[in-house]
Interface confidence: low
């Protein structure tokens, strides 16, 4: 939450550092140095050795049987007169050569050698951190705010007890940023500025540095731990898990060291783990900014016809419109090109079939005629014509197409098996003639399009992946009787003894990810929190908790009123909504500190200039941020006026609401995402908007754009009604 324009702030996390720190339990990802195989901590360069040019550099050698033995000794520095940074295993002589340097050191050069394999400790060649960065041994020596670090062996300008001799193995060398005790803020150092004792360094998380395109089949990065922090098993090892992905058997799959890969067409890269109880897990590698296909717009696959621009066409037509045969995608004759199956792994560039891998206006191919480089396959019919309807008009209540699968890939169940459930949430007799088989339909006039029931008890129903027909402008919210609906229901704000209690922020939820605040949320029902989809970096629900009844983001002073609840399910909002309904593992107990906030009436309009507030514990810009819940006051702005303030670059639709700051430089920011825009009407407070990532933090004269809750109110009620919460 920005209150004023200020400096960056992650020092807030009170990195008490050398003061009252107790020993910290190290997560699996960073520690557990017991008697275990450590070769996964090394980057292997086959048929390579290091030659020292500088004769002063030391080397230690010894006869051993395996590279694993070399690695274990290097990691523990056992019996070595230096800090081991790399080793070479001589396969012919069965010998280890341990080095206090690596290939990046000065006075050293790489050399080819059949019998040698070079292994370099990844900690010394990484320029990013894993977790808290306890194992970081890179060479960054400047703090977050740009101050040069004080050498660890020096007591000037700051006296300290972090002596290299007291922290053997922690590599307190030179003035490099380190995190010898695994503090929350990551690597840090004492600074050369007498006024600033210590500060964290701005070293990115490896998960931020690494990125992939598509589903990561071509990813060849250096991520070597899973999304839950488990270290990956080397591909060339069979312990603790035996597997069939042998590097020598699949030389093109990039099975280097223990890096995450996607050799088998999974949704994203994964690896076997060193945890004997977890055979494999996915890795948290974000999608690159210039990704050709991101998760939210995976096209609907078709084989007989073209949907939209045909990016999802997977049929076998292999001539262009006039009958000239297509050139194979994996061929460079007669036309050279880079649209190869290797470069576009998820675009199904098989054989010589027409495809649209690059977002052209329709499927195309290179032709076998040397004089005609490319041609469109415009003879493939459009799905809208061939299948009757693979798009819908208005809200799709008249959709009669044959799709019978939800957006998450579940097969729809028969309507006749679900009539009882349907009657539970609609108050009229549905048109049974439309509800044939298990086809996607919209019998309840859902604003967000056709849907169906599933056989899955956890996802009783879901929307189908059908788009509105191109050019269809029919409004989905139709309120003929009441052109302007009031947002408030006739109900008063709860007051005790004439004074509003802390219930006036009791609906505010702090969503915690791996024990840290990540997002806000609003308690709209005892078991349900409304928040944003950007708040869930991991698919493992055990990573999340909801804190209720707190005022301080760390829960200080809130012990009596704080409720900590696990998350049992995430229900994603309609396509493009950015909303998530988060189900709590058990209902919250409503009291003086925890309360629900009301939802607005569906499709309602709130008058311009209505005064509203956004709440959050997010990024304040304050270096001495106290962790208390912040509020910024905004006023509602009409969509047209809002668009003008955004210099016409933004066109708002019926699913968005705009609010501008009363005070320049205040408004929502990261860490506030998921939190509410709260407005009052007829003395009733309600959540009118949800904060989602916008266009910068509190930019002067740029109003904030929020998800309009009124547009999604029916969806929220439908989920609460149909996704049953087990009774305690």
């Amino acid at each position: 939450m920005w209150v004023t324009k200020l400096l960056p702030a992650l020092l807030l996390q009170h990195v008490l550092l050398h003061l009252l720190l107790l020993p910290i339990a190290i997560p699996y990802a960073e520690g557990q140095r017991k008697r275990r195989n450590t070769i996964h901590e090394f980057k292997k360069s086959a048929k390579t050795t290091l030659i020292k040019i500088d004769p002063a550099l030391k080397i230690k050698t010894k006869k051993v049987n395996t590279a694993d033995q070399c690695a274990n000794r290097c990691t523990r520095n056992k019996g070595l007169p230096f800090t081991c940074k790399a080793f070479v295993f001589d396969k012919a002589r069965k010998q280890c050569l341990w080095f206090p340097f690596n290939s990046m050191s000065s006075g050293v050069k790489k050399e080819f050698g059949h019998e040698f394999d070079l292994y370099e400790n990844k900690d010394y060649i990484r320029n990013c951190i894993i977790g808290k960065g306890r194992s970081y041994k890179g060479t960054v020596s400047i703090t977050k705010s740009g101050i040069k670090c004080q050498p660890w062996s020096s007591m000037i300008p700051h006296e300290h007890s972090f002596l290299p001799s007291s922290y053997r193995g922690k590599d307190l060398q030179e003035n490099y940023c380190r995190n010898p005790r695994g503090e929350e803020g990551g690597p840090w150092c004492f600074t050369s500025n007498p006024e600033v004792r210590y500060e964290v360094c701005d070293i990115p998380q490896c998960s931020e540095v690494e990125c992939m395109t598509c589903n990561g089949e071509s990813y060849r990065g250096l991520m070597d731990h899973t999304e839950s922090g488990k270290i990956c098993q080397r591909w060339d090892h069979q312990t603790p898990h035996r597997h069939k992905f042998l590097p020598e058997r699949y030389p093109d799959k990039g099975f280097d060291d223990n890096y995450c890969r996607n050799p088998d067409g999974q949704p994203r890269p994964w690896c076997y783990t060193l945890d004997p109880h977890t055979r494999w897990e996915y890795c948290a590698i974000k999608t690159c900014a210039d990704n050709t296909m991101n998760d939210t717009d995976v096209p609907l696959e078709t084989t007989e016809c073209i949907q939209g621009q045909g990016e999802g066409y997977r049929g076998t037509v292999n001539t262009i419109w006039n009958g000239i045969p297509c050139q194979r995608w994996d061929s460079q004759y007669p036309h050279e090109h880079d649209m190869t199956p290797e470069n576009f792994k998820c675009k199904d560039l098989r054989e010589n079939y027409c495809r649209n891998p690059d977002g052209s206006e329709s499927p195309w191919c290179f032709t076998t005629d040397p004089n005609i480089r490319v041609g469109y396959c415009s003879q493939i019919p459009n799905c809208d014509m061939s299948h009757g309807q693979d798009c819908y008009r208005g809200n799709g209540k008249n959709y009669m197409g044959n799709l019978s699968q939800t957006r998450s890939g579940l097969t729809c169940s028969m309507w006749d098996k679900n009539m009882e459930d349907l009657h539970r949430h609609i108050f009229w007799e549905p048109d049974a003639s439309k509800l044939n088989e298990n086809y996607c339909r919209n019998p309840d006039d859902d604003a967000h399009g056709p849907w169906c029931y599933t056989g899955n008890p956890l996802i009783p129903w879901d929307y189908c992946p059908i788009s509105r027909c191109e050019g269809d402008t029919t409004p989905t919210i139709v309120n003929l009787d009441h052109p302007v609906i009031s947002c408030a229901k006739t109900k008063q704000l709860r007051v005790v003894n004439g004074i509003p209690t802390r219930t006036n922020i009791g609906w505010m939820v702090s969503l915690r990810y791996r024990n840290k605040h990540i997002c806000g949320g609003s308690l709209i029902k005892e078991s349900w929190v409304l928040t944003a989809r950007q708040c869930f970096p991991s698919r493992d629900l055990k990573d999340y908790e909801a804190w209720l009844g707190i005022h301080d983001v760390h829960g200080r002073g809130d012990e009596k009123c704080k409720q900590v609840l696990n998350v049992s399910q995430l229900v994603y909002g309609p396509e493009g909504s950015d909303l998530v309904l988060m189900k709590l593992a058990r209902p919250a107990v409503l009291d003086d500190f925890v309360s629900t906030i009301d939802l607005p009436n569906y499709g309602c309009t709130i008058p311009e200039k209505t005064s509203c507030s956004v709440y959050g514990w997010g990024y304040t810009g304050l270096i001495n941020y106290d962790g208390l819940l912040r509020v910024a006051h905004l006023y509602i702005m009409g969509n047209e006026k809002c668009s003008q303030h955004h210099r016409g670059k933004v066109t708002l639709n019926e699913s968005e609401i705009c609010a501008g700051a009363e005070k320049i430089g205040s408004g929502p920011c990261e860490g506030d995402y998921g939190g509410p825009l709260v407005c009052e009407q007829h003395k009733m407070r309600m959540v009118l908007g949800v904060i989602v990532p916008g266009r910068g933090c509190a930019i002067p004269n740029r109003p904030g754009i929020f998800v309009r809750v009124a547009y999604y109110a029916k969806w929220i009620h439908k989920i609460i009604l149909t996704y049953k919460v087990p009774q305690s």
């Epitope: 109880h277 977890t278 996915y282 956890l458 698919r539 493992d540 055990k542 189900k583």
Partner: nanobody, 126 residues
Framework: EVQLVESGGGLVQPGGSLRLSCAAS????????MSWGRQAPGKGLEWVSA????????YYAESMKGRFTVSRDNAKNTLYLQMNSLKSEDTAVYYC???????????????????WGQGTQVTVSS
């Protein structure tokens, strides 16, 4: 072909116990999380419990915690549900299900299940 066959259902008095089994075939059982669900007469499917691929993590619906125990024997390709202190409201057809995703950590209420058995009837009545 994936097959899930439930057994062990029957008539039991309130307060009594039953142990349901689910024999799985047609897929690598120890790669997948598994789940139990139930459907009472005239009601929708209700999630009961789930277990990760290796049995390391178990999950239960709130009303069944402490009374029901889910377990698995990967060597026998079998999933179990031990039900104690049964109540009349536990009367339902119980189904076992295979998770769509082989990832152990995705078991539980966030899981998506792609195959269900035919079910076994459990009746709790005096």
């Amino acid at each position: 072909e994936v097959q899930l066959v439930e057994s062990g259902g029957g008539l039991v008095q309130p307060g009594g116990s039953l142990r349901l089994s689910c024999a799985a075939s047609g897929f690598t059982f120890d790669d997948y999380a598994m789940s139990w669900g139930r459907q009472a007469p005239g009601k929708g499917l209700e999630w009961v419990s789930a277990i990760s691929w290796n049995g390391g993590s178990t999950y239960y619906a709130e009303s069944m915690k402490g009374r029901f125990t889910v377990s698995r024997d990967n060597a026998k390709n079998t999933l179990y549900l031990q039900m104690n202190s049964l109540k009349s409201e536990d009367t339902a057809v119980y189904y076992c299900a295979k998770a769509l995703d082989p990832l152990g950590v995705l078991a539980g209420t966030s899981g998506i299940y792609d195959y269900w058995g035919q079910g076994t009837q459990v009746t709790v009545s005096s």
